[in-house]
């Protein structure tokens, strides 16, 4: 017997489609070998119609595909636009020739069934409603009107004009006339289910003079739309259920063998497996909504269904839409840490991947909030000012071309713990989710700035020092001036890194920044940080206030470290030519601040293209340029 298995018999009707799954034994060879679908001829020859090597016959062109699912040990042959010519004997198999392991499949495609010539066909989707039109002659106007459903032997009453209703149609069937027209009656049946499909007869009057009409009601289950997504990417289920359910609660559920488990609904229910990576967004008043899931996992593959019902749960007889989601494990999206850990007072540097082909796209970082339907307000973006409550502690560094941008958040508190999304206005598949965990600090931070209460005096020299441990000795140290458009790295002249050193004196590792002379524009947040190439590490922040000199007092720098820095400054001064670009207010770019749906981020961001570049060291010179110097001792 063949180790390949599938359906022995497949039957369908013209115009429909089939999806044939063939199962193969779980071996590495089987997973990687050629898969094929061939048609058996009278001679016993089997002619290939489609194979996993990319071959597609002329008669299947544009209407068939073959997909291998090595993780399930299956492959699927999808064939659309069936005709009676497709009826025949086929094989699905594995191997370099069509004489390999195979399984026989018989496919029968019938004509759409013949109905009595006067039959009116109504085709409706599950959950929708149908209005059946029943004409009659004027002389039958006073007579009883009825609709019955044909069974093998008889015709079972659905509803009649004496208000008799079959129990399974109570609350769903209505018989009525429109206006003054006495030649037609109507029967409306709502919340259609599969069981409602079949032949009906509507009748006015009795006996030989009765008016009768045959009706064929077809109730269709929605064909699942196939979605192929990469591991770690994102998927959007666009659900369009129609105006009649616009005011009902909406849901997305995932089919299991018993039922459909709700993943999210508009009543606030959310599956914990999707915490931090799902949003449901009502689109409009026409019953349209979408569900976005980021950070796709292997186990997210499966059958999904969206629907609407006041309970927020799947109910028979209500409209639905279905998808089958496949998650490809050979993903183009790099495998990054999905959990980042920080400590109170410390910092985190989060590397966000984006499609390297879209290096000019606008980059954003938003915080996922689970209340209501879930939303993700943007906190920072390449052309989006940092949200006020993150002043001085959040910046985005774009590294054009290498497929990564970095978001740094410092001065962490336990309130910062939660889920954050990296996204761009480009390829929406590259939305990724990060969970930030913040623990209470148990030791001193790695980077410490002195003096801690920094007040500089206008016109004088002011130095701040950043102490770092020996483990950062080989890394690049930097200072940057924070603005709500980014943290502009100040040019440095790094003496210490060029000196060969066998030992490392823990107490003397520092990088200093000197402002000389201090100007009013120097006031603000400064960061001291470490990085290795384009990989950013820890940071710490300090706010430098600028005061005018009070008469009769001379300002003294509070630490010896600053005195040492001044000596260095006499040896070599580097003119930074740093300036802040004009600080124009940029509207928030996103879906998010206004709780608009995430899809809008691209459109919104396009409008905001006017403003400055975050995380860049370029800028126009100030007329009185500050002197900045970085130096190791």
């Amino acid at each position: 017997k063949s180790p390949i298995f599938g359906p022995q018999e497949v039957s369908s009707i013209e115009g429909d489609s089939v999806s044939i799954t063939c199962y193969y034994p779980d071996t590495s060879v089987n997973r990687h070998t050629r898969k094929y679908w061939c048609r058996q001829g009278a001679s016993g020859m089997c002619t290939t119609l489609i194979s996993s090597n990319g071959y597609l016959s002329k008669e299947y062109s544009g209407r068939a595909n073959l997909i291998n699912f090595p993780e399930n040990n299956t492959f699927v042959i999808n064939i659309e636009q069936l005709t009676q010519d497709d009826t025949g004997s086929y094989k699905c198999g594995l191997g370099t020739s069509n004489r390999g392991l195979s399984f026989d499949v018989s496919l029968e495609v019938s004509q759409v069934p013949e109905l009595p010539s006067d039959t009116h066909v109504y085709t409706k989707d599950i959950g929708r409603n149908v209005t059946i039109e029943c004409p009659f002659k004027r002389e039958n106007a006073p007579s009883k009107k009825s609709l019955c459903k044909k069974t093998n032997q008889s015709c079972e009453l659905v509803i009649d004009s004496t208000e008799k209703v079959n129990p399974s149609y109570i609350g769903r069937a209505k018989l009525f006339m429109k206006g003054t027209d006495l030649t037609v009656f109507y029967v409306n049946i709502s919340h259609l289910t599969h069981n409602d499909a079949g032949l009906y007869i509507c009748q006015a009057g009795e006996g030989p003079s009765a008016d009768k009409k045959n009706v064929d009601l077809q109730v269709l289950a929605p064909e699942p739309e196939l979605l192929y997504k990469d591991l770690r990417s994102s998927v959007t289920f666009e659900c369009d259920l129609g105006r009649e359910v616009a005011n009902e609660a909406k849901y997305l559920c995932r089919m299991n063998k018993e039922t459909c488990d709700v993943i999210i609904n508009t009543l606030g229910k959310r599956d914990p497996d999707f915490e931090g990576r799902i949003l449901i967004t009502p689109k409009d008043d026409n019953g349209r909504f979408s569900v976005l899931i980021t950070g796709l996992r292997k186990e997210d593959a499966g059958h999904y269904q969206c629907g609407a019902h006041s309970s927020g749960l799947p109910q028979e007889g209500w409209p639905i839409q279905t998808w089958q989601l496949f998650v490809n494990e050979e993903s183009t999206i790099p495998n990054r840490r999905s959990v980042v850990k920080g400590v109170t007072g410390g910092s985190v540097a989060i590397a966000c991947p984006y499609n390297p082909k879209e290096s000019s796209s606008l980059k954003y970082w938003c915080r996922w909030e689970g209340d209501g339907n879930g939303h993700c307000p943007v906190l920072v973006g390449t052309q989006a000012q940092v949200q006020e409550e993150y002043e001085g502690r959040l910046a985005l560094f774009d590294q054009p071309g290498n497929g990564t941008y970095t978001v740094i958040l410092n001065q962490l508190t336990t309130e910062d713990a939660g889920f954050y999304w990296c996204l761009t206005n480009g390829d929406s598949r590259w939305r990724t989710t990060i969970e930030l965990q913040v623990a209470e600090a148990t030791r001193e931070p790695n980077l410490e700035v002195t003096p801690q209460n920094a007040t500089a005096v206008l016109g004088e020299t002011f130095t701040v020092s950043c102490h770092y441990p020996c483990k950062f000795y080989s890394q690049e140290k930097y200072w940057c001036k924070w603005s709500n458009k980014g943290c502009h790295i100040l040019p440095s002249h790094d003496e210490g890194a060029r000196q060969s050193s066998v030992s490392c004196d823990q107490s003397s590792q520092l990088v200093s920044m000197t402002l000389n002379p201090v100007s009013k524009e120097d006031e603000g947040w400064y960061w001291c940080g470490v990085k290795q190439g384009q990989t950013y590490g820890e940071t710490t922040a300090i706010y430098i206030a600028v005061e005018e000199r009070t008469r009769g007092s001379s300002h003294v720098n509070p630490t010896d470290a600053n005195a040492r820095a001044k000596v260095a400054l006499e040896e070599e001064v580097v003119d930074s030519s740093i300036s802040e670009k004009e600080n124009k207010a940029i509207p928030n770019p996103g879906p998010f601040a206004n709780e608009r749906e995430i899809q809008n981020v691209g459109d919104q961001a396009q409008e905001n293209r006017a403003s400055g570049d975050a995380g860049s060291a370029d800028g126009q010179s100030r007329s009185s340029s500050s002197k900045h110097h970085h130096h190791h001792h």
Partner: nanobody, 126 residues
Framework: QVQLVESGGGLVQAGDSLRLSCAAS????????MGWFRQAPGKEREFVAT??????????YYADFVKGRFTISRDNAKNTVYLQMDSLKPEDTAVYYC?????????????????WGQGTQVTVSS
Amino acid sequence: QVQLVESGGGLVQAGDSLRLSCAASGRTFPTYAMGWFRQAPGKEREFVATIRWSGSTQYKYYADFVKGRFTISRDNAKNTVYLQMDSLKPEDTAVYYCAATTLLGDPRALNEYAYWGQGTQVTVSS
């Protein structure tokens, strides 16, 4: 919930035929699969046949030992699945169980099925 009730079992001679019925009641789903498994005394439950449907398309799966002797079919209007068993052999003696699921992976796997009937006894004497 879905309730499944089997009927049609009994005692027959080798070579005879039987038709088993499985009626589903309660909640039914748009895409469904219903099948038959059997369990002979002292043996494990094994796959016999399954029918899966999606719209107007039907897929029928059979175990190797069936070899054209058994036919699975369904009556949509009655929510009933049938197993027509011809050319019965003594080794077909078993309790036959009806099973149903809303979602079908491998039709042969017991754990793919969510709902089970109580079973109907089929005895084939030689």
